[in-house]
């Protein structure tokens, strides 16, 4: 009853003459353990006998004996772990057929059939390829051999066009109840060049002898493989030449479908054949050419061919790093003249004249100067000739006004109070002068640009400077105006004595002045309108009070004269010319008032008076006036006074006072 038995094994086992077979086998029986195991070769059931007949290869007897002559058959199983594996070593062609596994338990019997296929010669492995091979896409190549046996070592080797493949293959074996095989797997990135090539998987024995092989031809799908050819075979051509480029399709799988041409990455219109012809090339046709060919795999682009169209330098132009340029700055000139090959020599021109020693594309001036202004042009030269000199480029060099000078327009000499006109001149300027500055700044008139009018010029307007200005101001050296003027700051100065002047002193007065232009001067001294002297000093050997008064000095030069302020000369002296005066006369009637006044000439004035009588007796009066009231006859007599100031004393002569009797007194007598 088949439902009671479950036996697992590969079904068919393959081998070849002299090899061996290993039959992996497991079983399960529902009731009871396996008691008897017989291995038949091609068993046939005898209906009459109700038993299987055939060659017995193995029989598990109680003592486990194998029939004589069948030592090559081994039962490797055991009843404990339900293993029914067996091997035949060596195996022969006539072993082909069925192996019958007769299994008997206490209650059940079963015959399991296993096919054994033993070929005369080793059979070839089978190469398995993926359905599609495409260049550079990694695939696994499999070489499968439905054989594996522990007692017989084999090896699978891969070859490409008969040459062992360098890639490492992974070999695996299977000896399971499901399958028996030896497999080699090779990871492989096919290249377009592998297309059509033969891959072989060889079966080798333990000695390396080739037992069998399988071969396949690779069908590697790839984009077109291109090369580009140029005729004439030089990619450097001259303007006007003709050039043909041919796109060769060295390989394409599948066949190519479209062709196009590109220049510098841009498709060329209406160029869809494998040949591109350029007639009478121009410089614009210089570039990198390639062809693009497509098939079902995708597009492919050839290597680029750099077509250089050579031509003589084109008319040049000059590029200037800055214009206008400021004097002193760095300026770079660049000669731009397209040419192929690049120019090897340059000639530079400034205002049409060749600049010696400058033969490079760039011409640098580290510090630009005014005379560098002008038109710059250049000529470029290559192997095909000298290019045309372009119109040139203008360099404008800007700089502050140069050589700024001041001119006095007046007829000289200039006198104080004159109107002076100054002009500010310069030799050159770029840009033009647009304003002027003047020092010192004053409320002066500028009647026109660069002209300064100073009305009523001051004596002290000594130096004036001007600047001519554009973007910068340049100052002229200051001009000394040399203004002529009458002496200034004239004053009288007492030289001696150092202290106050006393009568009798030696006195010197100096006529000072602060400045005069011209310097040559004359002096005049004046007192009360009278001329006293013509020296710078006025000297008094012994001053007297009569010399006191208001003095002036005058200083004159060729321009004019200047007077000092009046200077008061004060002479100090002791009281002098004292006299006693009597307002009512020197005869007074008794009983009246007699007033005596002490008159004096003194500087400083008298501060103290004393009165004396005819006996030189001091009277008890200290004022300037002596009042006798009422006057008596006995007051008659001579009187004198004394005056004192801080310089000294002076006294008057005697004056006689006569007091006469009144009529009443006479009447009483």
């Amino acid at each position: 009853d088949s439902s009671k038995w479950n036996i697992e094994h590969p079904g068919t086992i393959y081998a070849w003459e002299g090899a061996c077979v290993w039959v992996p086998c497991t079983y399960r029986v529902l009731d009871g353990a396996l008691e008897t195991f017989i291995l038949f070769h091609n068993p046939e059931y005898n209906q009459n006998m109700s038993k299987f007949e055939g060659t017995r290869l193995y029989e598990s007897t109680k003592d486990g004996k194998v029939p004589s002559g069948q030592k090559r058959v081994q039962f490797l199983g055991n009843k404990i772990n339900n293993n029914c594996t067996l091997s035949i070593h060596p195996v022969h062609v006539n072993d082909s057929g069925q192996l019958g596994l007769r299994m008997v338990s206490k209650t059940e019997k079963w015959m399991e059939r296993i096919h054994l296929n033993v070929s005369e010669r080793p059979f070839p492995p089978r190469i398995q390829l993926p359905p599609k091979l495409q260049e550079s896409q990694e695939v696994t190549l499999t070489c499968l051999l439905n054989f594996s046996c522990y007692g017989y070592q084999i090896q699978l080797q891969w070859l490409l066009e008969g040459v062992p493949m360098r890639q490492a293959a992974v070999t695996s074996t299977s000896l399971s109840t499901k399958s028996v095989f030896t497999r080699s797997e090779l990871k492989f990135s096919p290249q377009w060049s592998h297309h059509g090539k033969i891959v072989t998987c060889e079966l080798h024995d333990v000695d390396g002898k080739v037992l069998s092989e399988d071969m396949v031809q690779l069908n590697v799908k790839h984009t077109p493989k291109l090369t580009i050819e140029v005729t004439p075979n030089e990619t450097i051509v001259r303007k006007g030449d003709s050039v043909t480029m041919t796109c060769k399709v060295n390989s394409s799988n599948p066949e190519y479908t479209t062709v196009s041409w590109l220049k510098d990455g841009i498709p060329l219109k209406e160029q869809n054949t494998l040949m591109l012809t350029l007639h009478e090339v121009t410089k614009s046709q210089t570039g990198r050419y390639c062809c693009r060919v497509s098939n079902d795999v995708g597009p492919a682009t050839s290597e680029k061919v750099f077509l250089q169209v050579q031509y003589a330098p084109e008319p040049s132009r000059v590029q200037i790093s800055q214009s206008p340029a400021v004097e002193g700055s760095e300026v770079n000139f660049l000669c731009i003249s397209p040419a192929n090959p690049l120019p090897t020599n340059y000639t530079w021109y400034h205002n049409g004249k060749e600049v010696q020693g400058r033969t490079e594309k760039q011409f640098q001036i580290q510090k630009i100067l005014p005379w560098h202004a002008g038109t710059y042009s250049c000529e470029a030269e290559n192997i095909l000739g000298i290019g045309e000199r372009g119109p040139g480029t203008e360099l404008d060099v800007q700089y502050p006004p140069k050589k700024v000078t001041m001119v006095i327009e007046n007829p000289t000499p200039i006198r104080e109070g004159d109107t002076v006109t100054l002009s500010c001149n310069y030799s050159s300027s770029n840009p033009i002068v647009n304003h002027y500055e003047w020092r010192p700044r004053g409320a002066w008139e500028e009647p026109s640009l660069g002209v300064l009018k100073i009305q009523n010029i001051g004596w002290n307007n000594t130096a004036v400077a001007c600047a001519a200005c554009n973007n910068w101001c340049s100052w002229a050296s200051p001009v000394t105006l040399n203004v002529l003027y009458a002496p200034r700051g004239v004053r009288v100065r007492k030289i001696k004595p150092l202290s106050e002047i006393h009568s009798g002193n030696s006195v010197s007065l100096q006529c000072d002045f602060s400045s005069s232009h011209p310097k040559e001067v004359q002096f005049f001294w004046e007192k009360n309108g009278s001329l006293l002297g013509k020296e710078s000093q006025l000297n008094f050997d012994s001053i007297s009070p009569e010399d006191a008064g208001s003095y002036s000095c005058w200083v004159n030069n060729s321009i004019g004269q200047t007077a000092s302020k009046a200077w008061t000369l004060e002479v100090l002296y002791a009281p002098r010319r004292l006299r006693v005066s009597m307002s009512q006369g020197n005869q007074v009637m008794e009983g009246k008032t007699a007033t005596l006044t002490c008159e004096s000439d003194a500087n400083p004035p008298v501060y103290s008076y004393a009165w004396f009588d005819w006996n030189n007796q001091s009277l008890p009066y200290s004022g300037r006036m002596l009042r006798l009231e009422p006057v008596k006859v006995q007051h008659s007599g001579a009187y004198w006074c004394q005056g004192t100031n801080r310089v000294g004393k002076g006294h008057s002569p005697l004056i006689t006072l006569t007091v006469y009797y009144s009529p009443q007194t006479i009447g009483r007598r």
């Epitope: 004097e327 020693g357 490079e360 580290q366 510090k367």
Partner: antibody, heavy 123, light 106 residues
Framework: QVTLKESGPGILQSSQTLSLTCSFS??????????VSWIRQPSGKGLEWLAH???????RYNPSLKSRLTISKDTSRNQVFLKITSVDTADTATYYC???????????????WGQGTTLTVSS | DIQMTQSPASLSASVGETVTITCRAS??????LAWYQQKQGKSPQLLVH???TLADGVPSRFSGSGSGTQYSLKINSLQPEDFGSYYC????????FGGGTKLEIK
Amino acid sequence: QVTLKESGPGILQSSQTLSLTCSFSGFSLSTSGMGVSWIRQPSGKGLEWLAHIYWDDDKRYNPSLKSRLTISKDTSRNQVFLKITSVDTADTATYYCARAPPPNWDEYYFDYWGQGTTLTVSS
Amino acid sequence: DIQMTQSPASLSASVGETVTITCRASGNIHNSLAWYQQKQGKSPQLLVHNAKTLADGVPSRFSGSGSGTQYSLKINSLQPEDFGSYYCQHFWSTPPFGGGTKLEIK
């Protein structure tokens, strides 16, 4: 005619500052393109350029000495000055000032030289 | 920066001989080269500027030539007063002066 004359201290101690004056006549340092350089020469050795001042007050220095040098001018007094800080015995040399006339293009050269002033630096 | 290399460093010659001193620049100096003569204890004196223009008062036996990076000073028929040191100079190089050539009497 053009003349240049250098003046300096003659002797300095190490670490002191050297002040040199170049007084010139016969040209103006306000003329476009005009310049004056200082150049020195240790005894028995070659010429070593130190610094240059242009009419527009642009200054150039020898890179290896730049941090120690200061060049200046007084255009109105026709003088150019050079200061060298922290002098050392290696600065012992004859110091020249020289005029570079306005060039045609960029070809500055020295057409007039002073007679030189000698500096001795003692340690 | 452009470097100036002067050669030879020293040279012995006899009166009447012709000598050549060369100066090589590390880049094109566009003829902006000057030559100086310096006698013992004296200031240098300009001989040639713009590579080939003789300075005022310089005898015609001196001549300058060259272009680009190679320049030379030639002295024909050496005179006793020609012995001394010679320097080339290009203003925009660092340093501007060549190392010098000492011309001595053989």
